[in-house]
């Protein structure tokens, strides 16, 4: 035991009076702390700490857990420790799994001995693989295996401390080996535009991008000749183990002309630092002018194609165009393209290819455009020319009979009545009821007229046309009655007559 | 006689495309609207499409709308039902039928083909 | 459905069955019928007022009555087991056509 001067303090003594104590698994442990001044008895393993205020400390069935450093401590501060190992075949490493170095420093593969008498105590390679030439290690049983000088290299190396017991190699649970970077160059940065013009109010953001060999590089957006803290927003990337991407993008919600300027992206490690510049350039509103290259009212026949075009000016750039029918905008049969490759061009074109257009392709066609000022908008209505097409052709509840005919122009229904069996219906029926009917259905871009005649007129065989036309043609239907009795009954049309 | 056949059905895995047809016999083609017509496995008919007797109008349902593709060839007295980014859903027997009044596009179905089945299924 | 129908319907053979259909639509439009039995399509059965195609046999019959229409077997046959499915104009003012759940007829 330590001896001191008469009068100071003294650390206290411990019983057995050793540095190290070697015990067997399920033996008893007990250690006697004698001081005047007893505080606390403490152990230490890998991470883990106990305390107790016994000065005697007992474990009745020692465990390789038990396995670590016990220091008594007396009131002055003053301490004494013994290590203490449990021998235990069955668990010759106690171990703490993390395993992190940082380049070029030495780290520690925490896997302490249980007994300190097995010889060959080293690292190997997981899997029989063998450990890089270069890499050294000193070897502590108390507290695990230091790697000394950890290099890029041995990032995710899988390690296993090894013994040898009873001339047999004993391998511990296996560590992972996860190196953080050493700084050894100033980070690389680059910005996504070098100068920038807008109008008063666009959105102005710009994207710095940071490339290091880790996540611990510090970056920011500064204002040349001013303080003022920048709002910026941030994404990153890890691109395979030391090649770290971020993005911090600056954004100035709306720029004003006091906004105009030098904005500087500044990147530094404990290499060094490294910037670059982006220039602002805010200049009052922008403007959209479009000028139609066509009729905006357009007549189409049925089946044929039709172009839309339109001419525009736009400054800022256009960032978004559209066009759009019937709420549904086109993702594809249009085309926009700057008029000239010119960097300052302010004229662009548009195009929609309307191919073999439908009957119920009618309507209003618009093009939007729009950039962070102005939105713009140019309609063309187009009208599809097409026969007309009779939707339906009823004998409805009340007696009526009901024809419901679309197409473009607005299609006149007559009705006609062939007694007999007669192939010509000459003899015309005035409606009832006609009505011009609200498109919202099917069809679109069509009208949609509905005419009933009442059928309880006809006390005769015969056939009921119904014939709907316009300026492009006309299409008819037919409607046939046979009495059987006093049932007037509806008989397949197709069958009786053949228009 | 009328005769209404459909072609072979098959399967499909979500997302992609098959094409159906019908071939028309024993009536004037280019006089009738055509429809399609299905049956899901165990439930009830859903009328599907229909395209009007010179092909110039198409109609659908809400579920199939932007999807399926009607169209008829009447040179080839043929209909066909394009179905593209097809789903579990999907999975019927699919009827062709003729329209019972000439020139009429919406009506009653006096003729209806065999049908053929469509799984649709991963 | 725009059109309601019971799902089942049983009728002891030889005696007569009404099958009903409902909806808005039907107080303006008569209701068209289908009979399909298992593994076969559809075949129109009834149309328009109380109109059958050739070939169906008389004992099949349709009326109708407010929101209500009906098909009417008299004298039901063995062979006349089989779903049944109405149909008519959708009630959303669009031109399109809608069926019913369809109703499963046993003979007994």
């Known amino acids: 035991q330590p001896s001191v001067s008469p009068g100071e303090p003294s650390p206290p003594s411990i019983h057995p009076g050793k540095s190290d104590l070697i015990v067997r698994v399920g033996d008893e442990i007990r250690l006697l702390c004698t001081d005047p001044g007893f505080v606390k008895w403490t152990f230490e393993i890998l991470d883990e700490t106990n305390e107790n205020k016994q000065n005697e400390w007992i474990t009745e069935k020692a465990e390789a857990t038990n396995t670590g450093k016990y220091t008594c401590t007396n009131k002055h501060g003053l301490s004494n420790s013994i290590y203490v190992f449990v021998r235990d075949p069955a668990k010759l490493f106690l171990v703490d799994r993390s395993l992190y170095g940082k380049e070029d420093n030495d780290t520690l593969v925490r896997c302490p001995l249980t007994d300190p008498e097995v010889t060959n105590y080293s690292l190997k390679g997981c899997q029989g693989k063998p450990l890089p030439k270069d890499l050294r290690f000193i070897p502590d049983p108390k507290a695990g295996i230091m790697i000394k000088s950890v290099k890029r290299a041995y990032h995710r190396l899988c390690l296993h401390c090894s013994v040898d017991q009873e001339g047999k190699s004993v391998l511990s649970e296996k560590f992972i080996l996860k190196v953080r970077p050493a700084f050894k160059a100033v980070p690389v940065v680059s910005v996504s535009k070098a100068s920038y013009l807008l109008r008063e109010g666009e959105e102005f953001t710009v994207t710095c991008t940071i490339k290091d060999v880790s996540s611990s590089v510090y970056s920011t957006w500064k204002r040349e000749n001013s303080q003022t803290k920048l709002q910026e927003k941030y994404n990153s990337w890890h691109h395979g183990d030391f090649n770290y991407e971020r993005q911090a993008t600056l954004t100035i919600s709306s720029a004003r002309v006091n906004d105009s300027g030098v904005f500087m992206c500044y990147a530094n490690n404990t290499f060094g630092s490294a910037n670059v510049t982006t220039t602002l350039e805010v200049v009052d509103k922008g403007f959209i002018n479009i000028f139609p290259m066509i009729n905006t009212t357009v007549f189409v026949n049925d089946g044929e194609n039709v172009d839309l075009i339109v001419e525009y000016e736009a400054f800022p750039k256009p960032e978004h165009q559209q066009w759009i029918y019937m709420n549904r905008t086109f993702t594809d049969k249009w085309e926009d393209y700057p008029k000239s490759e010119n960097e300052s061009n302010i004229r662009y074109v548009s195009e929609l290819h309307l191919t073999r257009l439908k009957g119920t392709e009618g309507g209003t066609y618009t093009f939007l455009v729009s950039n962070s000022d102005v939105n713009a908008a140019i309609a063309f209505n187009v009208y599809v020319n097409t026969k007309p097409e009779i939707l339906t052709y009823d004998r409805l509840v009340n007696g009526m009979l009901q024809c419901v005919a679309a197409g473009f122009p607005e299609p006149t229904i007559d009705w006609y009545f062939c007694p007999g069996t007669e192939q010509r219906c000459s003899a015309s029926v005035l409606p009832v009821d006609v009505q011009t009917l609200n498109s919202s259905g099917p069809p679109f871009g069509k009208l949609v007229v509905q005419s009933s005649i009442d059928s309880s007129a006809f006390k005769h065989n015969g056939t009921v046309e119904c014939k709907a036309y316009n300026d492009v043609g006309k299409t008819s239907a037919y409607f046939n009655f046979a009495f059987k009795g006093n049932n007037k009954e509806q008989i397949h049309p197709h069958t009786l007559f053949t228009p | 006689q009328v005769q209404l056949v459909e072609s072979w059905g098959g399967v499909a895995q979500p997302g992609r495309s098959l094409r159906l047809s019908c071939a028309a016999s024993g009536f004037t083609f280019s006089s009738f609207a055509m429809h399609w017509v299905r049956q899901a496995p165990g439930k009830g008919l859903e009328w599907v499409a229909v395209?009007?007797?010179?092909?110039?109008?198409?109609y659908y349902a809400d579920s199939v709308k932007g999807r399926f593709t009607i169209s008829r060839d009447n040179s080839k007295n043929t209909l066909y039902l394009q179905m593209n980014s097809l789903r579990a859903e999907d999975t019927a027997v699919y009827y062709c039928?003729?329209?019972?009044?000439?020139?009429?596009?919406?009506?009653?179905?006096?003729?209806w083909g065999q049908g053929t089945l469509v799984t649709v299924s991963s | 459905s725009e059109l309601t129908q019971d799902p089942a319907v049983s009728v002891a053979l030889g005696q007569t069955v009404r099958i009903t259909c409902q909806g808005d639509s039907l107080r303006s439009y008569y209701a068209s019928w289908y009979q399909q039995k298992p593994e076969q399509a559809p075949v129109l059965v009834i149309y328009g007022e109380n109109s059958r195609p050739s070939g169906i046999p008389d004992r099949f019959s349709g009326s109708s009555s407010g929101n209500t229409a009906s098909l009417t077997i008299t004298g039901a046959q063995a062979e006349d087991e089989a779903d049944y499915y109405c149909?008519?104009?959708?009630?959303?003012?669009?031109?399109?056509?809608?069926f019913g759940g369809g109703t499963k007829l046993t003979v007994l």
């Open positions: 149909n008519s104009r959708d009630s959303s003012g669009t031109h399109l056509r809608v």
């Open positions: 395209t009007s007797y010179d092909g110039s109008n198409e």
């Open positions: 039928a003729k329209a019972m009044v000439r020139g009429v596009t919406f009506g009653d179905l006096d003729y």
